[in-house]
């Protein structure tokens, strides 16, 4: 008998109340194995969760989180709202990023500063939580001798900012 | 702020039926499911059922499947749980909870209390 | 229904203590393990979600860690206003299910 239920194909669950016949999964549940006794019920993507990709009697229904949220686990089984520009995600949620670095972006992580010296520039803006530095000139550019419109603004390496 | 403010204590008689409201503000509403949770000094939480607003549609505890009935209106922004043939073993708080997969926000919770 | 069991109902500790409150289900979760808070006055908080993830506002003496079956909370410098009830729910599967609670008090 057991041989019987083992030649149910994914899609299908093994009737005990038909002889072990192979039963097609009713509508809204999938097996995603041969040789199930019972096809599993759909998951339904309700709430903040919707739908990424739809149930087949061969798969489970896969969610996603609405706009502004993100998954956690492997399932998507919680929904957690994105960080703001300034912050990263951690273990622990959405920490601001450490002085020296930034993030631009509602995801990822935060990102030293650029360091304008190694180009040979200067910072031409000071970066934030939220923005790289704004490398200019060169300080030789700068220098006396260079031909410039307007005077610079005094320059300042990014770990003097101010946050 | 993201806030549910749930609707006065009540005392019912046995055998009658009680509707309790839950306001929802600060967020849109039909955007997340609303579950009910009950507290009972006994039983501590337990889970009845939730509802999305968006469609209407429920899923309950078994245990509760014949004893509480959810309905949302997303005009008012208001979630709604009827409790019907009301017993003692219905004397409780019972809290509104908007889902994440977690319950972020709750409730201020409705003590119901059946006596005759 | 996945049984949730906070094994200490009530625990006294001291201003400063170190507290872990623990946590059991009855199959794998997966990590979808939530911590809530609730005062005196009936009022329920978010702390944790996710097994460790801290909501936003709790203070950072609360954590949270796990896998499996087995969770643990822990404050690591109780202070007065901490004094409450704790419980532990998964969302694994419906029906969502609650631990019994861990109250605190202080000693």
């Known amino acids: 008998l057991q041989d019987l239920c083992s030649n149910c194909p994914a899609g299908t669950f093994c009737d005990n109340n038909r002889s072990q016949i192979c039963s097609p999964c009713p509508p809204n549940s999938f097996s995603s194995a041969g040789g199930q006794r019972t096809c599993d019920i759909c998951r339904q993507c309700k709430g903040v969760f919707k739908t990424r990709k739809e149930c087949s009697s061969t798969s489970n229904a896969e969610c996603d989180c609405i706009s502004g949220y993100h998954c956690l686990g492997a399932e998507c089984s919680m929904c957690e709202q994105d960080c703001k520009q300034g912050q990263e995600l951690t273990k622990k949620g959405c920490k601001d990023c450490c002085f020296g670095t930034f993030n631009d972006q509602k995801r990822g992580i935060c990102r030293p500063w650029t360091n304008c010296s190694l180009d040979g520039k200067s910072v031409l803006v000071n970066g934030t939580k939220e923005r790289d530095v704004v490398c200019g000139p060169s300080p030789a550019d700068l220098s006396p001798g260079a031909s410039s419109a307007t005077p610079p603004a005094p320059a300042r390496e990014p770990g003097h900012s101010p946050q | 702020q993201v806030q549910l403010q749930q609707s006065g204590a009540e005392l019912v008689r046995p055998g009658a039926s009680v509707t309790l409201s839950c306001k929802a503000s600060?967020?849109?509403?039909?955007?997340?499911?609303m579950h009910w949770i009950k507290q009972t000094p006994v039983h501590g939480l337990g889970w009845i059922g939730a509802?999305?607003?968006?469609?209407?549609?429920?899923d309950y505890n078994q245990k509760f499947k014949d004893k509480a009935l959810l309905t949302a209106d997303k005009s008012s922004n208001t979630a709604y749980m009827e409790l019907r043939s009301l017993t003692s073993e219905d004397s409780a708080v019972y809290y509104c909870?908007?889902?994440?997969?977690?319950?972020?926000?709750w409730g201020t919770g409705t003590t119901v209390t059946v006596s005759s | 229904d996945i049984q949730m069991t906070q094994t200490t109902s009530s625990l006294s500790a001291s201003l400063g203590d170190r507290v872990t409150i623990s946590c059991r289900a009855s199959?794998?979760?997966?990590?979808?393990l939530n911590w809530y808070q609730q005062k005196p006055d009936g009022t329920v908080k978010l702390l944790i979600y996710?097994?460790?993830r801290l909501h936003s506002g709790v203070p950072s003496r609360f954590s949270g860690s796990g896998s499996g079956t087995d969770y643990s909370l822990t404050i690591s410098n109780l202070e007065q206003e901490d004094i409450a009830t704790y419980f532990c729910?998964?969302?694994?599967?419906?029906?969502?299910?609650f631990g019994g609670g861990t109250k605190l008090e202080i000693r």
């Open positions: 509802i999305d607003p968006k469609t209407g549609g429920t």
């Open positions: 199959q794998d979760i997966r990590s979808n």
């Open positions: 909870t908007r889902d994440l997969g977690y319950f972020d926000v």
């Open positions: 729910q998964q969302s694994e599967k419906l029906p969502r299910t």
């Open positions: 996710y097994t460790s």
């Open positions: 600060g967020y849109t509403f039909a955007g997340f499911e």
